[in-house]
């Protein structure tokens, strides 16, 4: 018998070193995967049993010949994948019976030449992949054929020229995609694209196109249906007004010019592309943008300038420059990405004219933006900006009123900087619609009572690892944030807080408080008693208190937190938990108590929270394997549907001595049965 796996109507026989077709698969399979084997042929008679096949994938084998009768035997075959084989010849007969094929993949074979008309009968073919074959011509037949073809992939061949007579077989086709990437193209002969019925997308990445050849290409695309043109990874070192001029009689909407080592964007380079909506200039070497660089892009919606500019070298003169008003023509631009650049700073009119801009990403963009002032973003005053990403810019100070121009801003990301200051609250002045402020991973933030007084709309506040100080002031810095749903105060080594820290945050759903030092606050011996900072958080869903050194949980600290779905108390020093502390957590879905010092798991503590649990993590606790300590737990484990990962390996007895290292779940509770308190 074979080792194929069969699921529903799909048989997977891949990676089995097969040298012949299995003959004992179910006869009703519709998909057969034979990839990565040692097949040399696909004998038609071996497929007689599998006449329902719709998809046959025989990629990554050593097939050197295809018998025409295969498709006769498989009348319903729609997808035939023969990529990475050893086919060198395909004749008029090879696919003659494959009239119902919709997809044919012949990528990575050794088909150097297409003789006569092997695809003449493929009137249903919508995708044909002949990439990586050593073809020197695009000619796949004489006379019009492949009238339903939508994707023709000819990348990584040896095509030197595009000639009209070699593309006329596509005269009735509407190609959604023609991929000629990674071909050493040197010539676009007159009318070469006019012979194709319709061409919507052309990919010519990595095709060694220089500016002159690009200009010639664009003229040949004139008066075609082209909408998407990808010219990434060529050697388009400079563009001028003439480079794309041939595209003025098209409705081009997408243009990819990434990875071109583009240095000089000449004035008016895009002036003939009024329909363009998407432009990528990622990973280039642009020295300067001037006020006319983007002239004519009156409909552009998306512009990526990620790593588009010159990299900084020793000479300061090499800093790229964005002149004032460089973006002034882009009145419909909604998304601008300028990540990973070496721009010195913003100027007073850097972003002027971007009156539709909603998303602006400036991560690792600037070299001299240490201080944000109320002038930094003045050029965005007329932009309806919703999201601003300022991560990784070495920002150390935010001045009052910095964001006062951004009244519609919803998300502000200032994470991964070097901000060290006292937050007076005036930094956020004018952010009347703000939804999220991300400040995590900064140097030092000192809070005051008014730190967030001006942003009552805030729903998410992230303050992870910012060496947070003054958290214990009263009234609480968070008191104005009545709409807050997520608060992250983790990794701050917080040791002192007041009971009213979160008072009034009735909408809080997620509280991240892990990696702090709250142990003293929950001790019975704490002067003034334990600090119950969770009271009133009636809508709290997720609570993370991992790694806080906790060795006690006060009674009543989780009282009335009925909506809690997840509690993480892992990596603490908890040992004996008080009865009834989780009584209100009957809706709990996830409980993490891993790496504590828990020895016993008793019903009066864990009964309520275990009722509806999906996931429990109590690994690496020193369980005491006695009836009193764990019989209830073991019985529960053995009848629950809760997911308990690594139960066999990481739930081990620690005591008594003779049970040391013994898997908890194998503990025999039958001798405990007569102890009434431990019954299920």
């Amino acid at each position: 018998t074979n080792q194929c796996t069969v699921r529903y109507n799909v048989a997977d026989c891949s990676h089995l070193k097969l040298t012949h077709i299995p003959d004992d698969l179910p006869s009703n399979i519709t998909v057969l995967n034979l990839t990565h084997n040692q097949l040399r042929r696909l004998p038609p008679t071996n497929f007689t049993r599998y006449s329902q096949l719709a998809i046959l994938d025989a990629g990554f084998n050593s097939i050197s010949k295809l018998e025409p009768e295969l498709c006769q035997i498989l009348p319903l075959l729609k997808v035939l994948n023969l990529q990475h084989n050893e086919l060198s010849q395909i004749s008029d007969q090879t696919f003659v019976f494959c009239t119902n094929l919709t997809e044919l993949d012949l990528m990575s074979n050794s088909i150097h030449k297409i003789k006569s008309n092997p695809f003449k009968n493929q009137k249903n073919l919508i995708k044909l992949d002949l990439s990586h074959n050593g073809l020197s011509s695009t000619k796949l037949g004489t006379g019009v054929q492949l009238e339903n073809l939508q994707e023709l992939l000819l990348a990584k061949n040896k095509i030197l020229a595009l000639r009209s007579e070699e593309l006329e077989f596509l005269g009735n086709s509407s190609l959604r995609k023609l991929d000629l990437s990674s071909n050493p193209l040197k010539e676009f002969s007159p009318g070469c694209f006019q012979t194709i019925g319709k061409l919507f997308a052309l990919l010519l990445n990595n095709a060694q196109l220089n500016p002159h050849l690009t200009e010639k290409l664009c003229w040949e695309l004139s008066n075609t249906s082209i909408q998407n043109l990808s010219l990434a990874n060529n050697q388009l070192l400079a563009t001028s007004e003439s480079t794309f001029s041939g595209l003025k009689w098209t409705n081009l909407t997408q243009l990819d010019l990434s990875y071109n080592n583009l240095h000089d964007v000449g004035n008016g380079s895009f002036s003939y592309l009024p329909s363009l909506r998407y432009l990528s200039l990622e990973y280039n070497n642009i020295q300067r943008l001037s006020p006319r660089s983007f002239y004519g892009l009156s409909n552009l919606r998306y512009l990526s300038l990620k790593r588009a500019f010159t990299k900084q070298s020793v000479s300061l003169a090499s800093h790229p420059n964005i002149d004032d008003f460089s973006f002034q023509w882009l009145k419909y631009l909604e998304y601008l990405n300028m990540d990973d650049n070496n721009i010195p700073s913003t100027k007073s009119n850097t972003f002027t004219g971007l009156v539709s801009l909603k998303y602006l990403s400036l991560s690792k963009t600037f070299t001299s933006l240490q201080t944000l002032t109320n002038e930094t973003f003045v050029s965005l005053a007329h932009s309806p900006l919703l999201t601003l990403n300022l991560t990784k810019n070495h920002i150390s100070k935010i001045a009052n009123g910095t964001f006062s121009w951004l009244g519609q801003l919803r998300i502000l990301d200032l994470g991964l900087n070097e901000i060290e200051q006292k937050l007076s609250g005036q930094e956020w002045r004018g952010l009347r619609n703000i939804f999220e402020i991300y400040l995590s991973y900064n140097k030092y933030l000192q809070l005051s009572t008014s730190s967030f007084a001006l942003v009552p709309s805030l729903q998410r506040l992230m303050l992870r690892r910012v060496a947070l100080k003054n958290v214990d002031i009263s009234p609480s810095p968070f008191r104005p944030l009545r709409n807050l749903t997520i608060l992250d105060l983790s990794n701050n080594n917080i040791a002192n807080i007041n009971e009213d820290l979160l008072e009034g945050l009735e909408n809080l759903e997620i509280l991240d408080f892990q990696h702090n030092n709250l142990a003293r606050l929950w001790k019975r011996a704490n002067p003034g008693g334990p600090v119950n900072f969770l009271k009133g958080l009636s809508h709290l869903h997720i609570l993370n208190l991992e790694s806080n050194g906790l060795d006690e949980i006060p009674v009543g600290v989780f009282k009335n937190l009925f909506e809690l779905k997840s509690i993480n108390l892992g990596l603490n020093n908890l040992n004996k938990l008080e009865p009834f502390i989780f009584d209100d957590q009957t809706s709990l879905r996830s409980l993490n108590l891993q790496k504590n010092l828990i020895t016993s798991v008793e019903k009066d503590v864990f009964g309520p929270p275990f009722q509806n649990l999906n996931s429990l993590d109590m690994r690496f606790n020193p369980f005491d394997c006695t009836c009193e300590s764990i019989s209830w737990f073991v019985n529960w484990i053995n009848q629950t549907h809760t997911n308990i990962s690594e139960l066999s390996t990481h739930y081990l007895c620690n005591t008594p001595h003779h049970y040391y290292g013994f898997p908890l779940k194998l503990f025999d509770t039958s001798s405990c049965k007569d102890s009434a308190p431990f019954e299920l």
Partner: nanobody
Framework: EVQLVESGGGLVQAGGSLRLSCVAS????????TGWYRQAPGKQRDLVAE???????IYADSVKGRSTISRDNAKNTVYLQMNSMKPEDTAVYFC?????????WGQGTQVTVSS
């Protein structure tokens, strides 16, 4: 990802007619081969009819001459019109599209022909 939803099944008298519909989301029918299959209790799933990008159609011998498969690309819908129905046409009818090298199936619609 293509989602297929069949409708139009139900109880029909022998000799009656029925029109099944299959709506696709995620990929228009104009770019794939679309078929109707059926599965009677305890039997394997069999082809009823199929329509190709070219408009070509194929039918199982058992329904030839009394069934028509058609499609409306604008509505992303393929239809199966069945006439002169027989008790042996009772089955769950499934819609099928093969696209991007994947075999997509609907949940099926029950057709019962009573004599």
């Amino acid at each position: 990802e293509v989602q297929l939803v069949e409708s139009g099944g139900g109880l029909v008298q022998a000799g009656g007619s029925l029109r099944l519909s299959c709506v696709a989301s995620g990929s228009p029918f104009s770019i794939g081969a679309t078929g109707w299959y059926r599965q009677a209790p305890g039997k394997q799933r069999d082809l009823v009819a199929e329509i190709y990008p070219s408009g070509d159609t194929i039918y199982a011998d058992s329904v030839k001459g009394r069934s028509t498969i058609s499609r409306d690309n604008a509505k992303n819908t393929v239809y199966l019109q069945m006439n002169s129905m027989k008790p042996e046409d009772t089955a769950v009818y499934f819609c099928n599209v093969v696209r991007w090298g994947v075999d997509y199936w609907g949940q099926g619609t029950q057709v019962t022909v009573s004599s």
